[in-house]
Interface confidence: low
Amino acid sequence: FERTRSLQDPCSNCPAGTFCDNNRNQICSPCPPNSFSSAGGQRTCDICRQCKGVFRTRKECSSTSNAECDCTPGFHCLGAGCSMCEQDCKQGQELTKKGCKDCCFGTFNDQKRGICRPWTNCSLDGKSVLVNGTKERDVVCGPSPADLSPGASSVTPPAPAREPGHSPQ
């Protein structure tokens, strides 16, 4: 058993939260403060992410896992692991390079993030506009004039809008 073990890479015995210290005869040393190793057998520890500026600490760094950030109020996370914070806007607006701008006529945004999207074109489905759209809300499509006979079907909701993207900062 001892002989088999000696043939292995000695670093493979170092657990998460430690690193294999070449300067100390490959002893497993604990990660220094503000660093971590999330897997065993590491030869270095990674520097902990620091949540600064518009980023807030959601989860503190530990010796085995990186810190996690979220965004300060008024901003929201973007990207894997909240690697960007983007400014919130009001409903009826979208974020442009020059800040929050009202949606142009014929478009709407019902969220604090994302882009303004065109109102649903009711006529494409052979329907009419039952409720006009606003900057904050899509139009509501109703039955076509031909359907307004007794027994006609009730109001149908607008088609689902495409997934909102985000304006580049």
Epitope: I47, C51, G53, F55, A80, S83
Partner: antibody, heavy 120, light 107 residues
């Protein structure tokens, strides 16, 4: 310890291009923002643009839009800044800098700087 | 773009002096402000972030304060190593911008 090591000094002719590299070590490269900041002789600091390698898309200051291209190679943990149509006013020290998270962000690690001289 | 204006441009002081540098933003940047120290031929070094938080490893004689549009960097007792140029930087919005710098020189 995080280190950013930049390529060496360059002397260029007006109208040509320069490409400066910035190799990161000692930290997770992909999820941090790398920005490029320049400093003309005796002048202040000027942010040119930046990239988060995990996304691959760069943002640029309006002043440099169309003339600067920032890229990142995740496999080598290296960021690049290419500036085209060089003029004498582009003579400066060019720094790469890392921000903890995304940009806009504070620059807690800097490269040593690359001097670019534009002269005919 | 948000303009950052530092004052004074140059400051003559002696070792042991209390030194204050001011940075004004052209519009409110909340507390999204950093201070950097730069020595000739070297890259800048982060001293203060979030207007008043001390970066790890930075001596406690450095402190920052302010919010909105007016900010200050204070060195409580100037040391020989502190003679350098200091820059403020806002990260409230793109593009992040720097002040023009304040050179602290020996009186």
């Amino acid at each position: 310890q995080v280190q950013l090591v930049q390529s060496g000094a360059e002397v260029k002719k007006p109208g040509s291009s320069v490409k400066v590299s910035c190799k990161a070590s000692g930290g997770t490269f992909s999820s941090y923002a790398i920005s490029w900041v320049r400093q003309a002789p005796g002048q202040g600091l000027e942010w040119m643009g930046g990239i988060i390698p995990i996304f691959g898309t760069a943002n640029y200051a309006q002043k440099f839009q169309g003339r600067v291209t920032i890229t990142a190679d995740k496999s080598t943990s290296t960021a690049y800044m290419e500036l085209s149509s060089l003029r004498s006013e582009d003579t400066a020290v060019y720094y790469c800098a890392r921000s903890s998270g995304a940009y806009p962000g504070y620059f807690d690690y800097w490269g040593q700087g690359t001097t670019v001289t534009v002269s005919s | 773009d948000i303009q950052m204006t530092q004052s004074p441009s140059t400051l003559s002081a002696s070792v042991g002096d209390r030194v204050t540098i001011t940075c004004r933003a052209s519009q409110s940047i909340s507390s999204w402000l950093a201070w950097y120290q730069q020595k000739p031929g070297k890259a800048p070094k982060l001293l203060i972030y979030d207007a008043s938080s001390l970066e790890s490893g930075v001596p406690s004689r450095f402190s920052g304060s302010g919010s909105g549009t007016e900010f200050t960097l204070t060195i409580s007792s100037l040391q020989p190593d502190d003679f350098a140029t200091y820059y403020c930087q806002q990260v409230n919005s793109y593009p992040q911008t720097f002040g023009q710098g304040t050179k602290v020189e020996i009186k």
